[in-house]
């Protein structure tokens, strides 16, 4: 069910329209649901979820991660800096979400939904941000070559990459959700 169309909304006609913050919150939770479904298929298909050899594949990846300097943690919290980090991070994740598109059999639609919902989330957040100039968009040429490189990996590394992308994206979204609720 797309965000904003669950049974709770239908059953409560007196409910106020969703605020921008509520819409963003709901969108993140919707994407997290999708990630959960994708992780289930990944973990059922291989033993990557219990593997301790993650460092081998992590070297090839430059997945966005929240750090204290990004202004999203309570210590040194800065709403605008944090918002820029969240949007920049999501834009950087897009190439990895593109990589995931051909990685699932039974959850192909779910992978597409995660990708499309993330694009919508970025739009919501861009409306909220004041300092759009500070947001750096990834270079398409660099992304294209990264995608080619990831797709050329052997099967084991591709499985590991899929697992790491899902795990890191989940963590990034959770950190974002936490910070956005403090705004």
């Amino acid at each position: 069910v797309p965000p904003g169309e669950d049974s709770k909304d239908v059953a409560a006609p007196h409910r106020q329209p969703l605020t921008s913050s509520e819409r963003i919150d709901k969108q993140i939770r919707y994407i997290l649901d999708g990630i959960s479904a994708l992780r289930k298929e990944t973990c059922n298909k291989s033993n990557m979820c219990e593997s301790s050899k993650e460092a081998l594949a992590e070297n090839n990846l430059n997945l966005p991660k929240m750090a204290e300097k990004d202004g999203c943690f309570q210590s040194g919290f800065n709403e605008e800096t944090c918002l820029v980090k969240i949007i920049t991070g999501l834009l950087e994740f897009e190439v990895y979400l593109e990589y995931l598109q051909n990685r699932f059999e039974s959850s192909e639609e779910q992978a597409r939904a995660v990708q499309m919902s993330t694009k919508v989330l970025i739009q919501f957040l861009q409306k909220k941000a004041k300092n759009l100039d500070a947001i750096t968009t990834p270079d398409p040429t660099t992304n294209a070559s990264l995608l080619t490189k990831l797709q050329a990996q052997n099967q084991w590394l591709q499985d590991m990459t899929t697992h790491l992308i899902l795990r890191s994206f989940k963590e990034f979204l959770q950190s974002s959700l936490r910070a956005l609720r403090q705004m």
């Epitope: 919150d25 943690f73 309570q74 210590s75 989940k170 959770q174 936490r178 403090q182």
Partner: antibody, heavy 119, light 106 residues
């Protein structure tokens, strides 16, 4: 099976520093979405949230007690430590540590320690 | 900070009865509301998270509902072990806040 247990002094003199340790098992504090919080309850009164630490070391404190509190974690030892400076008789309470773990960060405490009474 | 107000502060009922208690938030907290039950001398126990989701192992006679600023916890067919104090808690953002509690006597 998830368990948490608080340990520390039962008696503290005014102006002293209280150090409480929460030892846990059955989960990892390096898993995203997981956090450990401290809550206290003076005799016969309501619950009061004190502090919270996340998997990524982000920390939050009760605004009224922030200047007196410090929360830290040792992921390898499966421990969370709370220190509270300048103790006062009004701080007499049962101190609980509790786990929060869900994808959407509802900050619901699904497992609690037995609590330790500090006078 | 978000303030949580519970009502009534105490109530008594008989085994088999049904009761409803309420919790108000001073501002909208979406569905980020949790309910706990505490028996004397024991640690609190999570009953309901996210306003209406029953925690695993909690009997179906418990039901949470509400959103934004108004929430209720309903217990049908009361049992002797349901006595104690019920607390609501906002889980929307920090600082986390608890209500003052509703003491239930069976």
């Amino acid at each position: 099976q998830v368990t948490l247990k608080e340990s520390g002094p039962t008696l503290v003199k005014p102006t002293q520093t209280l150090t409480l340790t929460c030892s846990f098992s059955g989960f990892s504090l390096s898993t995203s979405g997981v956090g450990v919080g401290w809550v206290r309850q003076p005799p016969g009164k309501a619950l009061e949230w004190l502090a919270f630490i996340f998997w990524d070391d982000d920390k939050y404190y009760s605004p009224s007690l922030e200047s007196r509190l410090t929360i830290t974690k040792d992921t390898s030892k499966n421990q969370v430590v709370l220190t509270m400076t300048n103790m006062d008789p009004v701080d007499t309470a049962t101190y609980y540590c509790a786990r929060s773990a869900d994808d959407y960060l509802y900050y619901s405490f699904d497992t609690w320690g037995q609590g330790t009474l500090v006078t | 900070d978000i303030q949580m107000t519970q009502s009534p502060s105490s109530l008594s009922a008989f085994v088999g009865d049904g009761v409803t208690m309420t919790c108000w938030a001073s501002q909208s907290i979406n569905d980020y509301l949790n309910w706990y039950h505490q028996r004397p001398g024991e640690a609190p126990e999570l009953l309901v998270f996210a306003a209406s989701n029953l925690q695993i192992g909690v009997p179906s006679r418990f039901r949470g509902s509400g959103s934004e600023t108004y929430f209720t916890l309903t217990i049908n067919s009361l049992q002797p072990e349901d006595s104690g104090t019920y607390f609501c808690q906002s889980g929307h953002s920090f600082p986390l806040t608890f209500g003052g509690g509703t003491k239930l006597e069976i």
